[in-house]
Interface confidence: low
């Protein structure tokens, strides 16, 4: 179900053991109860316990204080899921009724007798806050307390939102109080499903399958991707974009392997001469006088 | 209510490729999840790959690089492209659809509801 009505029972007084019908209970009033909840009625009638029914087995005889119990019979508070949005009002009936039979299913004794009724009728909103009341009537009083909860994974304000946390190939995300989701750290996305990659990745030239990643796309490289790799031959060169191999100064040809600039690097002319480069590895050396051959070495 | 239709399993050499299709009929929306499942005789069902909101697509590390999952919106139908098929690959294969719905006054709030399709017999010989 997406919420819970829980009832706490707290302490029973029947004083004279007595019953509705101005009967006295021997040896003493075995007493039980019957809850009904259901829709909200300006007047509460007969028929069908819309929000759910429940009844317990025999908590005392005439006058008794009624202990919280966490499981089995006799469960204290009482429970009644619903699975439909929580409308914010409801009506409630609490019988308590007398049995001379069985302890724990006092539900299907025959000659029970009933001892007192009360009605409650109002809005109550979802929420972790006990309402605590007290009923008398002219031989009885019962003391109670009563909530609305939400289910496991159910929030909002009428239980009606559903939220699993989840940290998995599909999402990964906790619910917030009011049941939308909250990302685990490194994931983003309506979902959470889209990983956070590594702060500065490239947005077009990296990605990530888990957070704090920063994987290259073809032809970029680098902690961030931002680094274009250049042309698997270019010797003398760089890129700014992948595959390419634009050449450093002095340099030529597809691979920028062919010197253009022979006569700084290589300094082939002598005695003084004057070098002037002509193309890839071409050079000339202008002697000075009285010096020959070609480098003017001679 | 989501009703799922595989086909494309049967007999296959190992080394070989099939390709498994799964559609799906009735209320589903592109912010569903879909995958494949795979249940090898006396083994739990384990997953395989799966295709998210987003179409992020996720494998099993015995797959990755051999399997590929991809999902055609228009047509509600979700591929399993299976290459260098193992003999360890056989085993009935099921389509998964979570549907995620949402849920009244909900930013992102959903409802889950996992979808099963009957499943197709993978088998790959030695």
């Known amino acids: 179900g997406s919420g819970i009505f829980q009832l706490r029972l707290q302490e029973f007084v029947n004083q004279r053991g007595m019953l509705a019908n101005g009967q006295s209970c021997e040896p003493g009033c075995r007493t039980f109860f019957r809850i009904c909840l259901k829709h909200f009625q300006a007047t509460f009638s007969e028929g069908p316990c819309t929000f759910g029914n429940v009844s317990t087995p025999v908590l005392g005889t005439n006058s008794f204080v009624v202990r919280d119990k966490n499981s089995g019979s006799g469960r204290n508070p009482l429970q009644l899921p619903f699975n439909f949005t929580w409308p914010g009002t409801f009506s409630l009936n609490i019988q308590a009724w007398h049995t001379p039979g069985d302890d724990l299913r006092p539900e299907t004794s025959p000659g029970n007798s009933l001892i007192s009724q009360i009605i409650i009728q109002g809005s109550l909103a979802v929420g972790k806050i006990w309402r605590t009341d007290e009923q008398n009537d002219t031989l009885t009083r019962l003391s109670y307390s009563y909530r609305v909860i939400c289910s496991d994974n159910y929030y909002g304000e009428s239980c009606s939102r559903l939220c699993k946390k989840r940290d998995d190939h599909f999402g990964h995300y906790e619910c917030q109080p009011d049941g939308s989701l909250s990302c685990l750290p490194g994931w983003t996305g309506k979902y959470c499903d889209q990983p956070i990659c590594l702060s500065g990745c490239h947005e077009q030239n990296g990605y990530c399958s888990k957070p704090d990643e920063c994987i290259c796309r073809p032809g970029w490289q680098g902690r961030l991707c931002n680094e274009c790799i250049p042309h698997n031959g270019c010797r003398h060169g760089t890129c700014s974009i992948p595959w390419q191999c634009a050449c450093d100064e002095g340099w030529g040809g597809l691979f920028c392997d062919q010197d253009l600039n022979y006569c700084t690097h290589h300094s082939p002319c002598k005695n003084g001469s004057t070098c002037s480069n002509s193309g890839p590895k071409g050079y000339t050396c202008t002697c000075l006088p009285g010096y020959t051959g070609e480098h003017c070495e001679l | 209510q989501v009703q799922l239709q595989e086909s494309g399993g049967g007999l296959v050499q190992a080394g070989g490729s099939l390709r498994l299709s799964c559609a799906a009929s009735?209320?589903?929306?592109?912010?569903?999840?879909m995958g494949w499942y795979r249940q090898a005789p006396g083994k739990e069902r384990e997953f395989v790959a799966g295709?998210?909101?987003?179409?992020?697509?996720y494998y099993a590390d015995s797959v990755k690089g051999r399997f590929t999952i991809s999902r055609d919106n228009a047509k509600n139908t979700v591929y399993l492209q299976m290459n260098s098929l193992k003999p360890e690959d056989t085993a009935v294969y099921y389509c998964?659809?979570?549907?995620?719905?949402?849920?009244?006054?909900?930013?992102?709030?959903?409802?889950?509801?996992?979808?099963w399709g009957q499943g197709t017999q993978v088998t790959v010989s030695s």
């Open positions: 998964a659809v979570e549907v995620s719905q949402s849920t009244p006054g909900g930013r992102y709030s959903v409802a889950y509801l996992i979808y």
């Open positions: 295709i998210a909101y987003g179409a992020t697509t």
């Open positions: 009735g209320n589903i929306s592109t912010g569903t999840a």
